[in-house]
Each structure stands twice: as C-alpha cells, then as structure tokens.
C-alpha cells in the first residue's frame, strides 16, 4: 500500500516540500522523541499472572538493528498459589511497528520500510472452548 | 527499491551505519498485516485484566490510526467474575516506530518518530507501599 | 444531563432485607460504573459495592455477606439488595456514577440520596 | 482498609480567606499503573456530596480554579485561594487505589 496521499485540500504540496523521485520517499531516520522512556511499572513481565522473557534480535541490515520480542513463559496463567493453571491461558499482545531494511544488490544498496510485528508481553485470558458436536 | 551507488571501495568498504537521509520506496514490506486489533483477536474482552481501545488518528502520521489500549479496570476479573483488587491491571507500553511528515503536509517527505503507545493490559501482583 | 434518583423503604424492620433502586438518566449504564455509598446521620461516608458497565462487581469485603447488586441497561436501573439489617444501618443510602472512559474509578455523579431507618 | 485522616476535623474561616485542608492515608495511594486515585468531594448541608478534585489535582467540571489539590503517596492538601459563601460544607477526602474504596472523617468549612 502506497502512504496515503491525505484529502487533496488539506496536502496541497507546500513550496517548502523536498523534490522526491517519483515512486520513492525520502525519509529521515533521526527519529523524533528518541530519547523518551518508558514508564512502565517495574518488573511486570516478572509479576504478571502471564509472565514473559525479553530476547534481543539483532539485524545490523535493519533500522533499529536491535528489536526486542517477549515471549510468555507458561501456557496457562499463575495462580494466587504460584502454580500454573492450565484452565487459563497466557496470550501474546503483539504490535505493528515499522522498521527500515537495507538491501544489498551488488555494489548499490536499496533502502525498504517494513511493518514488523512485536510481541509486547503476555496476558492471561479465559480459553475459548469448542465443543464437538 | 531505490538503488544509491555505494563507495567505489565496493566490496570491501561496506557503511556499516545508516544514512541519516535514505530514499525509499514508497510500497511497504508487510503491509497488509491487520491493524485494527479489534479484529485481530478478542484478547482484550477475554483477559483478566480486559482492555477498552480507543482510536488515536493523526493525518500528519503514517499510519494514521493507532488504537490506544486502556485498562478497564483497576483490579483484576477473578474466576467469580468479580473485581478483584488484590491483583492490578496494568497497561503494558511499546515504544513504536511511525512516520511524520516533515515538513507538515509534504505528500512525500517524512521522519522517523518514536511513540509510546499502550497495546493492552496485565494482571500484576501489586508491590505494597505501607506507611511506616 | 447526568441524573440519579434512588428509591427504597423509608422504614425497614430488624433483621429484614432493604432493596433499592437506583433510577439513571442522562447517561447509559453501559458505559458507567454505579457505586453505592451510605452516611449514617451525622457521620462520614461509607463505601458499600459497585457494578461496572461490564456486569463485574467489586463489593466491601466488611458487608459482602449481606449485599448483592445487580443491574437492567435497558431500563436504566441499578438493584442493591441488603439483608439482615440492624439499627446501626440507618443511613442515608446514595448511589453515584462513575464514568468508564475518564478512568479515575471514582464517583463523579451522586443521586440525592434515600433515607433508611432501621426500627421497630 | 486504607484509613484517610483528615485535619483539622473543622475550619473556622472568613469570605476571602485562603483555606488549606490536609488528608494522609495509611498506605501508598500509587497504584501499580503509576496513577494515584486520590480525590475531593463537598458535601453542603442537606445536600449529597459533589466531586471537586479528581486523581489528586484534575479539578472536575465546573469547579472554579480557585480550588487546587496536591501531593503526592500518602499526603495530600486541597487549597481555597479565596473563601466564598457557597464553598462552605463538609471536605471529605477519598481513595480509590484500594478496595474497599475509603473516605476521611470530613472537615467542616465554616464561618468564623
């Protein structure tokens, strides 16, 4: 899918707007807000009744190279006794996120936008039962 | 894709850095992948911690809708069907990666932006702060 | 606008059950919380159970034994049923509404309120 | 149950004065999303009780700037830059991090 080009009236293209090949985009990659952080409460994939482990994938043809996956730890969900109960189940939350891939061919490199889809953490979720007629 | 010629080193001195400017092409990898999480799955009505989604959308922003998680409740849904504040539904946050156009409007001129967006929730045992 | 009126027994004997009913307008019971919360006179405010807009409830541990709530969107009504009443649950009874999509989880509207004696 | 203790339990004060109300609770009031639902209602006399300040300072609507709240964990304070006639009342501070949800004893706003 092409980036939607927005209601006619409101893109109209400023003079202000960078000379683009046609088929192509340029793209900045000094990201906006690149030093925030996240404040999520602390240690939840430890705490959670649908517990998760982080790992680091790592491609230096992508931008960013590092992309972290989480990966829920048990298939049902904790109990309030510290055991697993198999009657729930621990799901992943995933999210799209975008990401820049470099291509080699040859002696020239191409550069491609790329939908990536992460798995944030886990939550613990009543299975949906289907019965055998 | 677009192709930029590399050094005349080529092979042997590869960049290992990313340009901060690169051309692409405008048809993205993936894209087709579903991005209305309301119909992705029913997570967020079948968690004990369930999750409410609200749509955040922003013409100037590629893709210009990202659906917003937030907990419905403070407590968790126990095997009762009740609230159960002795456990906490809490967000679970992603720094992501979008477009902005830059400089605003531009049809096809934009810049890396990270947001933070919460994609659903969890239940967590509550870490306990008493006075002393 | 946002309304709340409850309705129930001025006068309930010892050991005898109340029923309330919290009559909503303004608004629907979908998307709102309602919370009930009793003053007995010249007190403070004590916090007794609510209903969520998804059907899920959260009661006081203290009275649990002798509440249940229960709710009708299409009729706009939310039911608090109390047993086993005792002099000292003479109060003024409120129900307040609580709005989903603020999340602050607390009691932005409140009805009038309904007195209750308990006595013989 | 998370106790809210209010001070002082009654105000005595002049139209125009500046009012300080104080409530400390028990426990922490920062729930594990990081939000603290600590709140402030007005009950005046014959009337049911009315939300001033939301999760500790978000002043809900149609209430005068003149009312603010603040703090933080355990301690908070509500503030009356100027004293009118219609904020005399009862105070009573409120939490909803914890079950069962918990309110002070009240603070009387009154005339000197």
């Known amino acids: 899918r092409k980036i939607p080009k927005v209601g006619h009236t409101f893109f109209q293209k400023p003079e202000s707007c960078p000379p683009v090949p046609g088929g192509s985009m340029k793209l900045d990659i000094g990201i906006i807000n690149e030093n925030q952080r996240v404040s999520m409460s602390r240690n939840i994939e430890s705490r959670s009744t649908s517990p998760w482990n982080y790992t680091v994938t790592w491609d230096p043809n992508r931008y960013p190279s590092e992309v972290v996956q989480a990966q829920c730890r048990n298939l049902g969900c904790i109990n309030a006794q510290g055991k697993e109960d198999i009657s729930m189940n621990s799901v992943p939350i995933q999210q799209e996120t975008l990401v820049v891939r470099r291509k080699h061919q040859g002696c020239s490199v191409s550069f491609q936008l790329e939908k990536v889809l992460v798995t944030v953490g886990c939550t613990c979720v009543t299975p949906v039962i289907h019965h055998v007629q | 894709g677009i192709t930029i010629p590399r050094n005349p080193g080529c092979p042997n001195s590869e960049d290992k850095n990313f340009p901060r400017t690169v051309m692409v092409n405008l048809n993205i990898h993936n894209r087709n992948t579903n991005t209305n999480p309301k119909r992705s799955s029913d997570y967020y009505n079948r968690s004990t911690s369930p999750w409410n989604l609200h749509r955040n959308e922003d013409p100037e922003r590629y893709p210009s809708v990202i659906w917003e998680a937030k907990c419905r409740h403070l407590g968790c849904i126990n095997a009762d069907g009740n609230v159960d504040y002795h456990m906490n539904s809490v967000p679970i946050q992603q720094e992501i990666l979008v477009l902005r156009r830059e400089p605003p409007h531009c049809p096809n001129s934009f810049r890396l932006e990270k947001i933070l967006v919460s994609v659903g929730c969890t239940c967590v045992t509550p870490i306990v702060h008493h006075v002393a | 606008q946002v309304q709340l009126k409850e309705s129930g027994p001025d006068l309930v004997a010892p050991s005898q059950s109340l029923s309330i009913t919290c009559t909503v307008s303004g608004f629907s019971l979908t998307s709102y919380g309602i919370h009930w919360v009793r003053q007995p006179p010249g007190k403070g405010l004590e916090w007794l159970v609510v209903i969520w807009s998804d059907g899920t409830t959260t009661y006081n541990s203290a009275l649990k034994s002798r509440l249940s709530i229960s709710k009708d969107n299409s009729k706009s009504q939310v039911f608090l049923k109390m047993n086993s009443l005792q002099t000292d649950d003479t109060a003024m009874y409120y129900c307040?509404?609580?709005?989903?999509?603020?999340?602050?989880?607390?009691?932005?509207?409140w009805g009038q309120g309904t007195s209750v004696t308990v006595s013989s | 149950d998370v106790v809210m203790t209010q001070t002082p339990l009654s105000l005595p004060v002049s139209l125009g004065d500046q009012a300080s109300i104080s409530c400390r609770s028990s426990q922490s009031l920062v729930h594990s999303n990081g939000n603290t639902y600590f709140h402030w209602y007005l009950q005046k006399p014959g009337q049911s009780p009315k939300l001033l300040i939301y999760k500790v300072s978000n002043r809900f609507s149609g209430v005068p700037d003149r009312f603010s709240g603040s703090g933080s964990g355990t301690d908070f304070t509500l503030k009356i830059s100027r004293v009118e006639a219609e904020d005399l009342g009862v105070y009573f501070c409120?939490?909803?991090?914890?079950?069962?949800?918990?309110f002070g004893a009240g603070t009387n706003l009154e005339l000197k």
């Open positions: 307040a509404s609580s709005y989903d999509y603020l999340y602050h989880y607390t009691m932005d509207y």
């Open positions: 409120s939490q909803s991090t914890h079950v069962p949800l918990t």
